[in-house]
Interface confidence: low
């Protein structure tokens, strides 16, 4: 899936605070890190706020408008059931058909003003800045453009030495600078960011099946 | 085949307002989709200016939000960029395009915008 | 600083398999959308979603994704493919866009 079907709200979900990773969780004890990003609760929601359905968005819809904004529906499947389920019992949605996570929803209008924000905001008051489209009718989801700024995340992650039929070389922006070890010391020395180093180091590569869809 | 124009003054004062505006042809705006702003400075990497729906919901990048103003003109089919308080930091190049969420699948030629007295 | 990290730069030889690779806790949930530049040009959309290609994209441009990973792959490079590769997603927060800050790829 990818974004091609349009369906999603077009909008971009409220701003909020990103949750801060733990990364050292992910190595203790290697259990799998929460997805970052706005709650699925959002994107649920506006999905479902902008489909013009009468009967309300099937489960097998409502993952084709998170893939076309971009969500990763396989990766995230069991969230997105949990999510419809808590949107549910909130009463932020309404189950037209089926029970469970399947069936069909549809947005409670009494309970969803423009822009419902299932979710609790983290300090810090952000407020939704206008509606990111629960309410607008896209005849296509529109591509919501989001701003590469802000770097309000935990230090820049080292990044991994790039496949080996590659020869590194020395930056080119200084923010980019990256950490060329391997993957664990990698971790450990997250910050320690080498300054660029000049030494390209050119690795037979070796072909790779390309992956395709 | 959806086209995008970027046109307006290559040249302008710090402490002024940039403005340009974006044609768009073989797609209407109002049929959805966001329409965006993105910048280059010369040798640089992209920074993503803004967007806006048909429907004029904008969204910003929030280190430029504070001086940006991003507007759509369904009628005429063009959707626009103000930046105000310029100053030799905002010299680059711009483009306009099409977007949905984050993929941006056609782009303007761009226009290169030198701030200078 | 952006969200997204790209190595600056990375070389290939002549028919070979390069990866570029970009690295941001926003694509656990979020697709990289890949991006081409060459000199004096707009950049191109090469690769977006899972692993989609707009018309016109030669097949030897792939992508994959793997935990806060996103990688674009070139199986077979071409002298034409040497430029300026950016990836781009949605922010944590998911309401903003963010760019890498770009890999210059050299075709040796």
């Known amino acids: 899936m990818s974004e091609t079907a349009p369906a999603a709200p077009a909008a971009a979900p409220p701003a909020e605070k990103a949750p801060v990773k733990k990364k050292a969780a992910k190595k203790a004890g290697g259990t799998p890190r929460k997805a970052s990003g706005p709650p699925v609760s959002e994107l649920i929601t506006k999905a479902v706020a902008a489909s013009k359905e009468r009967s309300g968005v099937s489960l097998a819809a409502l993952k084709k408008a998170l893939a076309a904004a971009g969500y990763d529906v396989e990766k995230n499947n069991s969230r997105i059931k949990l999510g419809l389920k808590s949107l549910v019992s909130k009463g932020t949605l309404v189950q037209t058909k089926g029970t469970g996570a399947s069936g069909s929803f549809k947005l409670n209008k009494k309970a969803a003003s423009g822009e419902a924000k299932p979710k609790v905001k983290k300090a810090g008051g952000t407020k939704p800045k206008k509606p990111v489209g629960a309410a607008k009718k896209p005849k296509k989801a529109a591509g919501g453009a989001t701003p590469k700024k802000s770097a309000k995340k935990t230090p820049k992650k080292a990044k991994k030495p790039a496949a080996a039929t590659v020869t590194k070389k020395v930056a080119k922006s200084p923010k980019k600078a990256k950490v060329a070890k391997p993957k664990k010391a990698a971790k450990s020395a997250a910050k320690a960011v080498k300054p660029k180093a000049a030494k390209p180091k050119v690795v037979k590569p070796k072909k790779a099946a390309p992956k395709k869809k | 085949q959806v086209q995008l124009q970027e046109s307006g003054p290559g040249l302008v004062k710090p402490s002024e307002t940039l403005s340009l505006t974006c044609a768009v042809s073989g797609y209407s705006i109002s049929s959805g989709y966001y329409w965006g702003w993105i910048r280059q400075p010369p040798g640089k990497g992209l920074e993503w200016i803004g967007s806006i729906y048909h429907s004029g919901s904008t969204y910003y990048n929030p280190s430029l939000k504070s001086r940006v103003t991003i507007s759509v003109d369904t009628s005429k089919n063009q959707f626009s960029l103000k930046l105000s308080s310029v100053t030799a930091a905002d010299t680059a190049v711009y483009y306009c395009?099409?977007?949905?969420?984050?993929?941006?699948?056609?782009w303007g030629q761009g226009t290169l915008v030198t701030v200078s007295s | 600083s952006s969200e997204l990290t790209q190595d600056p730069a990375v070389s290939v030889a002549l028919g070979q398999t390069v990866r570029i690779t970009c690295q941001g806790d926003s694509l656990r949930s979020y697709y990289a959308s890949w991006y081409q530049q060459k000199p004096g040009q707009a950049p191109v959309l090469v690769i977006y979603g899972k692993n989609n290609r707009p018309s016109g994209i030669p097949d030897r441009f792939s992508g994959s994704s793997s935990g806060n990973t996103a990688s674009l792959t070139i199986t077979g490079a071409q002298a034409e493919d040497e430029a300026d590769y950016y990836c781009?997603?949605?922010?944590?927060?998911?309401?903003?866009?963010?760019f890498g800050g770009g890999t210059k790829l050299t075709v040796l």
């Open positions: 781009n997603s949605r922010d944590s927060s998911g309401n903003h866009v963010v």
């Open positions: 395009a099409r977007g949905k969420w984050s993929k941006f699948d056609y």
